[in-house]
Amino acid sequence: TQNKALPENVKYGIVLDAGSSHTSLYIYKWPAEKENDTGVVHQVEECRVKGPGISKFVQKVNEIGIYLTDCMERAREVIPRSQHQETPVYLGATAGMRLLRMESEELADRVLDVVERSLSNYPFDFQGARIITGQEEGAYGWITINYLLGKFSQKTRWFSIVPYETNNQETFGALDLGGASTQVTFVPQNQTIESPDNALQFRLYGKDYNVYTHSFLCYGKDQALWQKLAKDIQVASNEILRDPCFHPGYKKVVNVSDLYKTPCTKRFEMTLPFQQFEIQGIGNYQQCHQSILELFNTSYCPYSQCAFNGIFLPPLQGDFGAFSAFYFVMKFLNLTSEKVSQEKVTEMMKKFCAQPWEEIKTSYAGVKEKYLSEYCFSGTYILSLLLQGYHFTADSWEHIHFIGKIQGSDAGWTLGYMLNLTNMIPAEQPLSTPLSHSTYV
């Protein structure tokens, strides 16, 4: 008689990434009997919640339940009903909520409280909603990409992200760019991590890792743009801001009250003789780059070397995976190829930013104008951050790999977060066991 497959013995987990600009829900799946193996967890679904980030609901917390409904209902459909009660749900909020908490702990707490009450109404095993630290965000992103790349496995893996790197057990560094913060995380080469706040020690699968991480709050792409606008409007002679980071012919009216609605622009706040100003794009990459560099204070460093704003950064080491907005922006600009040099990227950015706005709108008719208008800034910001902020060079640029997904799972902190909270990354290498014989009868 023919062997019959038993119902698959699988487990599921849900993580909601409550970012500054939006919330995404991720569903993960893994074979129950292989929980401690590396690389067995994979993403089966991503659901992007319609609307802004949860911090924007501070004046309308009663709307949070409706906001989360569609994606939570999607999770109900994707995960078999028999598994609902044992499927853990975690929500991690990042820099948008960190900024709200800076303004008021109560306001942030109220938002999370309503989120928790909403998520508790579903049949899953809700494990809590919390604001994760920047250090956690960096660390979990690093764990995610190295887990998916098979870097923690002692076994030879069958896939590789780049052809020349097949069996190298050196971990990848992680570069994460969000809307409100950016993280850099990697294992330095025999370098003392001079600032304790930036040092992490892990023991994973029997190996020790000394990891450097830092999260730059206010240096995500959206908050960096607000910072740049607040800085530049200080020296504008009238209510017109001629901005090199926007395409020629682009125009947009900005409320001064919106400009100062974030703790990130506090240092540039001043009284302006107008309530609104108009951005007028002039599309000049070099000038845009120069303006962005003024956001990075490189004049002060209390360590042997720094990134910017007096933050310690060891010499860069090894390959890096650049994900989240690093990837989305560069993918849009068609600059993610391993073959594109840093000089070529810069050249292409110069051309892109110089293109007239009307031309850009025609070429990318399907893209929302709000997002489309900001790619020149975002691309220039990414280059500025990587080159001047983190000290990548034209030579080391080839060690940056712009990654969206690895083996079908999104690169980002959520998988690492779930692996940690479900205790699926053992400190010691699990004993190798013979292949499971429970699959067929």
Epitope: R101, M102, E103, S104, E106, L107
Partner: antibody, heavy 123, light 106 residues
Framework: QVQLVESGGGVVQPGRSLRLSCAAS????????MNWVRQAPGKGLEWVAS????????SYADTVKGRFTISRDNSKNTLYLQMSSLRAEDTAVYYC????????????????WGQGTMVTVSS | DIVLTQSPASLAVSPGQRATITCRAS??????MHWYQQKPGQPPKLLIY???NLASGVPARFSGSGSGTDFTLTINPVEADDTANYYC????????FGQGTKLEIK
């Protein structure tokens, strides 16, 4: 040292308007949420309105919603309360109060208070 | 609105003794409860924030405890200068105050 000085109080007829000001000094004004709290003669304290540090959150007590407007001018280090359609029950000492902090986070409690300005609504 | 009920409405305590004032919230406020002292003709003064943290410059004779719905302000030992009205305030929702407790020193 932190100082909050209210002004603009006085006697006003029902239905009329009044604008209170609170001049702040001794701290970085734009880093703190600010509030108005009132106290009717011989009565307890009643919160009136809040304006968070980055204007993310502006809120009013139900008793004044739609009639009072809180605002701030960070360049002048000044908090305002525009009061319109005044009623007899709005008679009180109006205090300007600063939000406190829990370490690096803002808190919705009041760590410094001004001396108050008296508003009397009477025909 | 969250209603705060203070008890007792007034109390008289001898110097050197302990004074205890309680504040009950109509719904849970986590640890977002704060205490103020107000003397006649003066603005309120912050004593305790977030249930148990002593405000700057406040003597250690003052202490606070509680979480959820039930909170306590304790003054031990009481001194003559402590004659005042005491108010609790929650900040879990838009701020509300208790009705006040009048403390007299015998």
């Amino acid at each position: 040292q932190v100082q909050l000085v209210e002004s603009g109080g006085g006697v006003v007829q029902p239905g009329r308007s009044l604008r209170l000001s609170c001049a702040a000094s001794g701290f970085t004004f734009n880093n703190y949420g600010m509030n108005w709290v009132r106290q009717a003669p011989g009565k307890g304290l009643e919160w009136v309105a809040s304006f968070s540090s980055s204007s993310t959150y502006i809120s009013y007590a139900d008793t004044v919603k739609g009639r009072f407007t809180i605002s701030r001018d960070n360049s002048k280090n000044t908090l305002y309360l525009q009061m319109s359609s005044l009623r007899a029950e709005d008679t009180a000492v109006y205090y300007c109060a600063r939000h406190g902090r829990y370490g690096g986070y803002g808190g919705f409690y009041f760590d410094y208070w001004g001396q108050g300005t008296m508003v009397t609504v009477s025909s | 609105d969250i209603v705060l009920t203070q008890s007792p409405a007034s109390l008289a305590v001898s110097p050197g003794q302990r004074a205890t004032i309680t504040c009950r919230a109509s719904e849970g406020v986590k640890s977002y409860m704060h205490w103020y002292q107000q003397k006649p003709g003066q603005p309120p003064k912050l004593l305790i924030y977030k249930a148990s943290n002593l405000a700057s410059g406040v003597p250690a004779r003052f202490s606070g405890s509680g979480s959820g719905t039930d909170f306590t302000l304790t003054i031990n030992p009481v001194e003559a200068d402590d004659t005042a009205n005491y108010y609790c305030q929650q900040s879990w929702n838009d701020p509300t105050f208790g009705q006040g407790t009048k403390l007299e020193i015998k």
